[in-house]
């Protein structure tokens, strides 16, 4: 009961943890304007994998998106690949695992067969998760060190009077994000391996005992009982998250409480 | 169509203080960003303050700040600004206007004239 | 607070010339998000309230008759009226709408010979 509970618990964190992965590289907000000890703009920053925002105070919101693919940072590529990569692993654990789960039965599928599922799942998970976790990390330190370089020369002259303030860019939300869905589905896969152990077949330590009766013989060799329903699960690939990606590039937001900062 | 109705022109006295309407329509009242703008006689125009409707968040310009109160109605649909402690300073002609994309104003009021006088 | 210098303060010119007035910011308006420059151009007839003529520094709001032309980014913009008409007699403002406080620049009166 023990074992269904850790992997039915591993398969779920798992899942919001891949859905998590999978609305952080869609989110706009990996980077968001920094407002602190800046003068005050009517206009406001924010940058994805994907495309950057500006929010104007007006509630008009334009995005752009990085047409290019050789003019982007090497580091913005790699933290897409890295998200990616994460999310592909993400659903296979996902696909695997319901088979694996202890609570569904498929034919005769022998407990060895599902405790190695359980493995191979719970592998792919804590994979996406370190994919997931490396990914907004590099992506933060990135920001971080921009962050102090913009600062260094906040201030740039041209020509003496003139002023150009440079935006700055702190963590956005979908950091965040990024950071727990990582969490949840290393989390999730670290549960999956813990089950495994407990679905994998006990060895028992006692060797088969040969009672020879006069006439004819037979071995009685102790095993465990196996019992199927026999009944196929109908298990539908269920979409997890829907980026929810807008066709249009301009949007008219309405002003909210946050326009004004 | 966009329009931007104020209030009538204002003779106040000095030290008192002056609401100022202004009631737009032919849009959605909250979706909008009001802004207020000053223009003494023969002078240039001056930013005073906006309005979220929507919200009732308002932003200042630091020089009219303890001069104006920017507010808005949702029932009645309708933005004011107060003037306090008026001067003969405060003589000027008050626009409200639309804030739409690119943070610029396309529709305006036809301007509110108030004169301080004793 | 930025400063809109604009000049020159008036000018004077025959109906169907080119004009040209230039408005000068204390601090760049260019907005590197979106590559866009956050300036707006205003005329104002006698009389009347300001009316709204280019935004983004280059954008023609609608209704605005295509003689009218913005150009310059950063600090410098200009604004050319490719054949004047009579009924462009007005003052013309260029306005910061990038910084808080958002401000205007004194104007530029354009007058018909």
């Known amino acids: 009961m023990a074992v269904t509970a850790c992997q039915g618990l591993g398969f779920v964190v798992s899942l919001i943890g891949i859905a998590g992965i999978i609305a952080a590289t869609c989110m706009d907000q990996w980077s968001t304007q920094d407002l602190y000890n800046n003068p005050v703009t009517a206009v406001f920053n924010y940058q994805g994998l994907w495309r950057s925002c500006v929010r104007e105070s007006s509630g008009f919101t334009e995005c752009r998106g990085y047409f290019t693919l050789l003019g982007l940072p090497a580091m913005l590529q790699a933290v897409r690949a890295l998200m990616i990569v994460g999310i592909v692993l993400g659903a296979i654990g996902l696909l695997v695992s319901i088979f694996a789960l202890k609570c569904i039965r498929i034919g005769s599928m022998e407990d060895s067969a599902k405790a190695n599922m359980t493995l191979t799942s719970g592998i792919m998970f804590i994979v996406s998760g370190l994919c997931a976790i490396a990914g907004v990390s590099v992506f933060a330190n990135m920001l971080v060190t921009n962050f102090w370089m913009s600062t260094a020369n906040m201030y740039t002259g041209m020509g003496g009077m003139v002023q150009t303030v440079q935006t700055r860019y702190t963590f956005g939300a979908a950091l965040f994000v990024g950071w727990v869905a990582g969490g949840l589905t290393l989390i999730g896969g670290v549960m999956m391996c813990i089950a495994c152990r407990g679905l994998a077949p006990e060895e028992t330590n006692y060797k088969a005992v040969s009672y020879h009766a006069s006439g004819h013989s037979v071995a009685y060799k102790p095993g465990g009982f196996k019992a199927s329903t026999g009944f196929g699960s109908n298990t539908k690939n269920k979409k997890i998250y829907d980026g929810g990606a807008r066709t249009e590039d301009e949007v008219q937001s309405y002003p909210s409480k946050h326009d004004y900062v | 169509e966009v329009q931007l109705q104020q209030s009538g022109r204002e003779v106040v006295r000095p030290g008192t203080s002056v609401k100022v309407s202004c009631k737009p329509s032919?849009?959605?009242?909250?979706?909008?960003?009001i802004d207020w703008v000053k223009q003494r006689p023969g002078q240039g125009l001056e930013w005073i303050g906006g309005?979220?409707?929507?919200?009732?968040?308002?932003v200042y310009n630091e020089k009219f700040k303890a001069k104006a109160t920017l507010t808005a109605d949702k029932s009645s649909m309708t933005t004011n600004m107060q003037l306090s402690s008026l001067t003969s300073d405060d003589s000027a002609v008050y626009f409200c206007?639309?804030?739409?994309?690119?943070?610029?104003?396309?529709?305006w009021g036809q301007g509110t004239l108030v004169t301080v006088s004793a | 607070d930025i400063v809109m210098t604009q000049s020159p303060s008036s000018l004077t010119v025959r109906a169907g010339e080119k004009v040209t007035m230039t408005c000068k910011s204390s601090?760049?308006?260019?907005?590197?998000?979106?590559?866009?420059?956050?300036l707006t151009w205003y005329q104002q007839k006698p009389g009347q309230p300001p009316k709204l003529l280019l935004y983004?520094?280059?954008a023609r709001e609608s209704g605005v008759p295509d003689r009218f032309t913005g150009s310059g980014s950063g600090t410098d913009f200009t604004l050319s009226i490719s054949s004047v008409q009579a009924e462009d007699l007005a003052v013309y403002y260029c306005?910061?709408?990038?910084?808080?406080?958002?401000?205007f620049g004194a104007g530029t009166k354009l007058e018909i010979k």
């Open positions: 206007a639309r804030r739409v994309r690119g943070n610029s104003f396309d529709s």
């Open positions: 032919g849009y959605a009242f909250t979706n909008y960003l």
């Open positions: 309005i979220n409707p929507g919200s009732g968040d308002t």
């Open positions: 601090q760049s308006l260019f907005n590197s998000g979106n590559q866009r420059n956050y």
């Open positions: 983004w520094a280059t």
């Open positions: 306005q910061n709408v990038y910084f808080y406080p958002l401000t």
